[in-house]
């Protein structure tokens, strides 16, 4: 029996009931010239069922018995192969089931191709089996809001099956969709059965549907697109973080600097180092060292991790991140343990705002990356 | 098994015009897109521009509009790739790609262009 | 275009050891990520698409995870034949880009 299920998304009209959607593609049936074949369709709550064969309304004759969820083909030929479908029509929504038919003599066993993904993508469908169109890859299809930032690229997919081959063409906000109807138009591939619309703006709003069809049907999904305009601010960091950590002399440990910022952000890990057996410059201000900053040889930025620590790793480290805008900073402290002491729960250290509002990066060229003197900008 | 096999290194005067081949053996040709990717040496890898035969659709990267061309010979299972114009920067290796659902699957063995006067 | 940051550019390790490659898009590229390994002289070969989909005949140490903008490909034990070149590939817009690359050396 049939193992997967799907819904023709055939409204243009967001607010239509919820459909579900093929997965795979639909189980073939094979029988030989003259043989009986009888497939069950199995729809929960199936007020009334309706079968199609590719897209035509089956009704019952003198070799095709209906009775249920039965479908019975007496004395199958040729003829009778094809892409069939039962619908379960339910006030909240409906459901379809479909199956391919093939009457063969000859039964091999498929194609071997060395493929991957393929059936999603394009493939020239020959023969005489005449096939309304389908969806062939509905994961692809499944997000249908599109909230994107402005400038960003968005792509909607609708990747589709039949025979003869569909055609695809795109509406926006049931209107045919022109390239002249944005700057810089957009791009379709037939081949991927896709849109892309490249630096998205507030006009792109709206409501996009893709309408795949040929000559025994027609198909349908709709998108909703959001573009969401950029409101430039400084990285905000995830409260929290880093977090306190303790580890035994030997151990590893790591801190995590969760950052937001719709512009390219810059993050810095910053420790307290000493000079000359000093913490503090002749003017006060602390020798601070770059550990760790992102950039083209630096692997995830946003994680600091120690190996192998020692007593002189304890203390303070900062995430500096920064962008066009502004810059905010939060840090942790280290606790290093000896060896035969256990790390117990780690105790809360919030630094006085008084001390923090006094911090501020001093130069030094004795030490290799030591931050630029500048003042930090502590944000609650 | 699905193969790749394009034509032979190239050597180039700058201003000139090279045209690379990339023939498909082993599998449906019309039914996938192939792309075209260079490689200069030492450096990364840059995607240049794509035929969908069976659709008769091209796209090429902005770098390179104007100056290459994509064709396709459905009969012969080739596609071919013409850059113009050359410049000693073009010397790379080109490689044609079969995609498999937008992502290249299958590559081709690579054909060394040389620009130099 | 979408710009694709792969890092580190290189990295010296050990047969055995644990390899993370990260790259970053510079926009939501949903899960439209294949990563691919190149060695000197030869074509590129791949590895993993959709983000974390194995292709056929590929060793199952590598792994690939991520979503949105942030990806990693994942070497669970290092093999000899695992020193090479990998690539990121982005395919959510179809001016396709590639990361610039991250070189796996023997250290």
């Known amino acids: 029996r049939p193992s997967f299920s799907l819904v023709e998304d055939t409204t243009l009209e967001p607010e239509e009931p919820p459909t579900k959607y093929q997965i795979s593609q639909p189980e073939v049936y094979v029988a030989a010239p003259g043989e009986s074949l009888e497939v069950r369709c199995l729809l929960k709550d199936a007020a009334v069922i309706s079968w199609t064969k590719d897209g035509v309304h089956l009704g019952p004759n003198n070799r095709t018995v209906l009775i249920g969820e039965y479908l019975q083909i007496k004395g199958a030929t040729p003829r009778d192969s094809g892409l069939y479908a039962c619908t379960a029509t339910r006030t909240v929504d409906s459901e379809t089931w479909y199956f391919m038919v093939n009457v063969t003599d000859a039964i091999s066993s498929g194609d071997d191709e060395d493929d991957t993904d393929g059936a999603e993508d394009f493939v020239s469908e020959n023969g005489n089996n005449k096939r309304a169109p389908y969806w062939t890859n509905t994961e692809k299809m499944e997000k249908r809001l599109h909230a994107v930032p402005a400038a960003n690229t968005v792509k909607f997919r609708c990747p589709a099956g039949g025979n003869p081959t569909p055609t695809m063409r795109w509406l926006k906000n049931g209107k045919e969709f022109k390239q002249e109807h944005r700057i810089g138009g957009y791009k379709v591939r037939n081949q991927h059965w896709s849109l892309i619309m490249e630096s998205v703006v507030p006009s792109d709003k709206g409501n996009y549907t893709c309408v795949v069809e040929n000559e025994y049907g027609s198909i349908n999904h709709t998108y909703h697109l959001d573009v969401v305009e950029r409101s430039p601010h400084r990285p905000i960091l995830q409260a929290g973080l880093p977090a306190n950590a303790s580890t035994v002399v030997g151990g590893d440990v790591e801190f995590v600097c969760k950052v937001y910022s719709d512009a390219q952000p810059h993050i810095q890990w910053i420790k307290h180092v000493e000079k000359n057996g000093s913490k503090y410059g002749p003017d006060g201000l602390p020798y601070l060292k770059v550990l760790k900053h992102s950039g083209i040889n630096s692997s995830n930025a946003e994680v600091l991790a120690l190996f192998n620590v020692t007593e002189a790793d304890a203390g303070e480290y900062i995430c500096k991140v920064s962008n066009y805008i502004g810059q905010a900073n939060q840090s942790a402290w280290l606790t290093v343990l000896p060896k035969q002491q256990a790390p117990g729960r780690e105790k809360e250290i919030t630094a006085s705002p008084d001390y923090l509002e006094k911090l501020e990066f001093r130069h030094d060229s004795g030490l290799n990356d030591i931050f630029e003197a500048q003042k930090i900008e502590w944000h609650e | 098994q699905v193969q790749l096999v394009q034509s032979g290194a190239e050597v180039k005067k700058p201003g000139s015009s090279v045209k690379v081949s990339c023939k498909a053996s082993g599998g449906t040709f019309s039914s996938y897109a192939i792309s075209w990717v260079r490689q200069a040496p030492g450096q990364g890898l840059e995607w240049m521009g794509y035929i969908s035969p069976y659709m008769g659709e091209t796209h090429y990267a902005q770098k390179f509009q104007g100056r290459v061309t994509i064709t396709a010979d459905e009969s012969t299972s080739t596609a071919y790739m013409e850059l113009s114009s050359l410049r000693s920067e073009d010397t790379a290796v080109y490689y044609c790609a079969r995609e498999s659902y937008e992502y290249f699957d299958i590559w081709g063995q690579g054909t060394l262009v040389t620009v130099s006067s | 275009d979408i710009q694709m940051t792969q890092s580190p550019s290189s990295l010296s390790a050990s047969v055995g050891d644990r390899v993370t490659i990260t790259c970053r898009a510079s926009q939501s590229i949903s899960n439209d990520l294949a990563w691919y390994q190149q060695k000197p002289g030869k074509a590129p070969k791949l590895l993993i698409y959709a983000t974390s989909i194995l292709q056929s005949g590929v060793p199952s140490r590598f792994s690939g995870s991520g979503s949105g903008t942030d990806f990693t490909l994942t070497i669970s034990s290092l093999q000899p034949e695992d020193f090479a070149t990998y690539y990121c590939?982005?395919?959510?817009?179809?001016?396709?880009?590639f990361g610039q690359g991250t070189k796996v050396e023997i250290k």
């Open positions: 590939l982005q395919y959510y817009d179809y001016s396709y880009t």
